[in-house]
């Protein structure tokens, strides 16, 4: 699986990585002005796990399982 993955929050993440086989999902999350793009585990694609892992209380997130599916426009849909 390929995801956009930036180590630190960034407004427009363009770095694509081949996720290791442990990761079966891509995540994009917006918390305030922070946008996170990550390789992720689908079992952690729920509000509680995302907020805990990102240490953010309020956010919107989108998980998907296709190559490079975690781009900004997905959050706007």
């Amino acid at each position: 699986l390929q995801c956009y993955n930036c180590p630190n929050p960034t407004a427009d993440c363009k770095t694509a990585v081949n996720c290791s086989s442990d990761f079966d999902a891509c995540l994009i999350t917006k918390a305030g002005l922070q946008v996170y793009n990550k390789c992720w585990k689908f079992e952690h694609c729920n509000f509680n796990d995302v907020t805990t892992r990102l240490r953010e209380n309020e956010l919107t997130y989108y998980c998907c399982k296709k190559d490079l599916c975690n781009f900004n426009e997905q959050l706007e849909n």
Partner: antibody, heavy 121, light 107 residues
Framework: EVQLVESGGGLVKPGGSLKLSCAAS????????MSWVRQTPKKRLEWVAY????????HYPDTVKGRFTISRDNARNTLYLQMSSLKSDDTAMYYC??????????????WGQGTSVTVSS | DIQMTQSPASLSASVGETVTITCRAS??????LAWYQQKQGKSPQLLVY???TLAEGVPSRFSGSGSGTQFSLKINSLRPEDFGSYYC?????????FGAGTKLELR
């Protein structure tokens, strides 16, 4: 304050079994992935097991696969490592560690004090 | 499995000096690299993750750099409490592997 306290180590004969425990406090244990990492007498660090927050996924290196089993009881805030068919190579200090630092997987931000396992006849 | 090769194995330095420890991965791990410090008789402590992000409470004299397969940890103006062992670890995915460690000793 985050605390991880391991117990259950000791001297065991080759082929024997041992169950390690790690009591967690000071954080929402059920929300965090956890790992066991050991340190050999030569001071090398070796990761031995990982379990996700809900216990749904586990990972092991080939060196312990089929012999070690990681599990957790989120109601008791306790992590376990069941070790069987022990070999002399398993002699080490065993640490439990909290896994998943910020948005990252497999980054261990808190470690226990360790429990010593010696496999010898 | 990804092999992590750390160098040097040991290093002598004086308080106030600057030292650099390197870590090489056997394949591309992007920026998925962490550094830990371990003092004698204690558990490891996280210093850096994502190759260059300092963990909470880590002094700014520590800095990490690199991506892909080549990484380094630099410690500026060594303090007495900085002596001990340092380990790199990739966090790209399982199986996780560590470097063999670098022992930083007081000259």
């Amino acid at each position: 304050e985050v605390q991880l306290v391991e117990s259950g180590g000791g001297l065991v004969k080759p082929g024997g079994s041992l169950k390690l425990s790690c009591a967690a406090s000071g954080f929402a244990f059920s929300s965090y992935d956890m790992s066991w990492v050991r340190q050999t007498p030569k001071k090398r660090l070796e990761w031995v097991a990982y379990i996700s927050s809900g216990g749904g996924s586990t990972h092991y290196p080939d060196t312990v696969k089929g012999r070690f089993t990681i599990s957790r009881d989120n109601a008791r805030n306790t992590l376990y490592l069941q070790m069987s068919s022990l070999k002399s190579d398993d002699t080490a200090m065993y640490y439990c560690a909290r896994d998943g630092y910020y948005a990252e997987y497999y980054v261990m931000d808190y470690w226990g004090q360790g429990t010593s396992v010696t496999v010898s006849s | 499995d990804i092999q992590m090769t750390q160098s040097p194995a040991s290093l002598s330095a004086s308080v106030g000096e600057t030292v650099t420890i390197t870590c090489r991965a056997s394949e591309n791990i992007y920026s998925y690299l962490a550094w830990y410090q371990q003092k004698q008789g204690k558990s490891p402590q996280l210093l850096v993750y994502n190759a260059k992000t300092l963990a909470e409470g880590v002094p700014s004299r520590f800095s990490g750099s690199g991506s892909g397969t080549q990484f380094s940890l630099k410690i500026n103006s060594l303090r007495p409490e900085d002596f001990g062992s340092y380990y790199c670890q990739h966090h790209y995915g399982s199986p996780l592997t560590f470097g063999a460690g670098t022992k930083l000793e007081l000259r």
